[in-house]
Interface confidence: medium
């Protein structure tokens, strides 16, 4: 793993702990929580991420849903299972053994059940909306500059492949991103859209998650691009299941 | 069926106000944005600005800043348009229209039943 | 601000005949147009959306056309419940500005 070694860090992911105790003394850094090691030369995935993030579920808010099959994280923050490889476990129990199937992103799919409840696989989220509201600037930013700018940080600072980023749509002062990412397009060692849209929503709240490095400072042609409000749409490749009464409630 | 039914016709005096309600009803209300057109008689359509339900963010066309305030309640679908200090370059056909909070889909495909508005002294 | 520069303002046509209708953008608009038609004392109706794309229930001799700043509509084998208003509309940016209209009559 490429920790740093003079310091010995993980450059991407913050809440870890690390020591040269790899192989031949080499920096190695798990995660906090769940004790996995990760790899920092890549983002760290959001399974593990929210293990290591002990704080206090954020309240529930109903939101806009792009189609009536988009999710939206009303749930908050929660003490997740992540798989051997870092993957949320498609069935998650609190502990009060109240379940849940999740997709995989985290976010809950189904109703809430007791231990029988059964999740069959965890299910992929293959399109993913952000939907971004940005401060009053003097005007509108340009499109293709701000295009540019987005693409260019999903590209550089999360790693995430050009061609997962389907589209940056404008119209001031709303901004949606949308990556996509089918299960048969994601390739050994791509950057899942889940984990990018994860570091995303964390840089734009101030709580970077990358080790050491400044803040996000979004710019479009040097003129800042502050955000006011962030809202994230998840469709999975199997709609989701809840009962009627959670649909139209 | 969608529907966008709007409030009756004004008869108003100049330098009054007005409140326009818009009801919708057959669709979820917060997953379109509600934005409001003028058409004065025997002209062509303006833009008079728009509103997204789940936060109240209003967008307005420059023109119509300070004569029309966007408003929700989201607890019975309707959308109001309050127009202020009234002249008679006011007079016309206000309608409502719904547009998909998707920006890559850009339309307005659901138009209100328009409500007239006569300013006379 | 984009402006909308339609054409004709006017079109008078016989059934079974076919009419464009055009719009000028006074910027790269990407596509993002709308085509309504309105009849007297109605309420408009979306024809076309996205420069090309027919709405729900739209007859298929209704067709959109056009990019970066040109557009048109096209339709074949005049009806008469096509006699009217059409309005063009971009969505690029705020304001989303409509042309001045054409108003089509029964020749």
């Known amino acids: 793993h490429t920790a740093a070694q003079d310091n010995c860090t993980c450059p991407t992911n913050k809440m870890t702990v690390c020591s040269p105790d790899g192989p031949g003394g080499r920096c190695q850094c798990r995660a906090l929580g769940s004790g996995m090691a990760v790899d920092c030369s890549t983002l760290t995935s959001k399974c593990l991420l929210l293990k290591a993030r002990m704080s206090a579920p954020k309240n529930a808010r109903t939101l806009v849903r792009p189609s009536e099959h988009a999710l939206v994280d009303n749930d908050g923050l929660y003490d997740p299972d992540c798989d051997p490889e870092g993957r949320f476990k498609a069935r998650q129990c609190n502990q009060t053994s109240v379940c849940w199937c999740v997709n995989s992103v985290g976010v809950r799919r189904t109703d809430k059940g007791d231990l029988s409840l059964r999740c069959d696989e965890l299910v992929r989220t293959h399109h993913i909306l952000i939907d971004l509201r940005h401060r009053p600037t003097a005007g509108a930013f340009n499109h293709s500059d701000l295009d540019a700018e987005l693409r260019r940080l999903f590209r550089e600072r999360y790693r995430l492949h050009p061609k997962f980023v389907a589209a940056v749509h404008y119209e001031q002062p709303t901004i949606q991103i949308e990556l996509r990412q089918n299960t048969s397009q994601k390739a050994a060692g791509d950057v899942d859209i889940g984990d990018a849209a994860y570091y995303f929503e964390r840089d734009i709240k101030g709580e970077s998650l990358f080790q050491g490095r400044g803040g996000l400072d979004l710019r479009v042609r040097g003129e800042p691009l502050q955000v006011e409000r962030t809202l994230i749409y998840y469709l999975d490749e199997i709609p989701p299941k809840f009962s009627m009464k959670r649909l139209t409630a | 069926e969608v529907q966008l039914q709007q409030s009756g016709p004004e008869l108003l005096k100049p330098g009054a106000s007005v409140k326009i309600s818009c009801k919708a009803s057959g669709y979820t209300f917060t997953d379109y944005t509600m934005h409001w057109v003028k058409q004065s008689h025997g002209k062509s359509l303006e833009w008079i600005g728009g509103?997204?339900?789940?936060?109240?963010?209003?967008n307005y066309n420059e023109k119509f800043k300070d004569k029309a305030t966007l408003t929700v309640d989201e607890s019975s679908s309707t959308a109001y348009m309050e127009l202020r200090s009234l002249t008679s370059e006011d007079s016309a056909v206000y309608y409502c229209?719904?547009?998909?909070?998707?920006?890559?889909?850009?339309?307005?495909?659901?138009w209100g039943t328009g409500t007239t508005v006569t300013v006379s002294s | 601000d984009i402006q909308m520069t339609q054409s004709p303002a006017s079109l008078s046509a016989s059934v079974g005949e076919t009419v464009t209708i055009t719009c000028r953008a006074s910027?790269?608009?990407?596509?993002?147009l709308a085509w309504y038609q309105q009849k007297q004392g109605k309420s408009p109706q979306l024809l076309v959306y996205n420069a090309i794309t027919l709405a729900d229930g739209v007859p298929s001799r209704f067709s959109g056309s056009g990019s970066g700043t040109q557009y048109s509509l096209k339709i074949n084998s005049l009806q008469p419940e096509d006699f009217g208003s059409y309005y063009c509309q971009h969505f690029w940016s705020t304001p989303f500005t409509f042309g001045s209209g054409t108003k089509l009559e029964i020749k």
């Open positions: 509103i997204y339900p789940n936060y109240g963010d209003t």
């Open positions: 910027g790269n608009i990407h596509n993002y």
């Open positions: 229209s719904r547009k998909t909070v998707l920006l890559r889909l850009r339309y307005f495909d659901v």
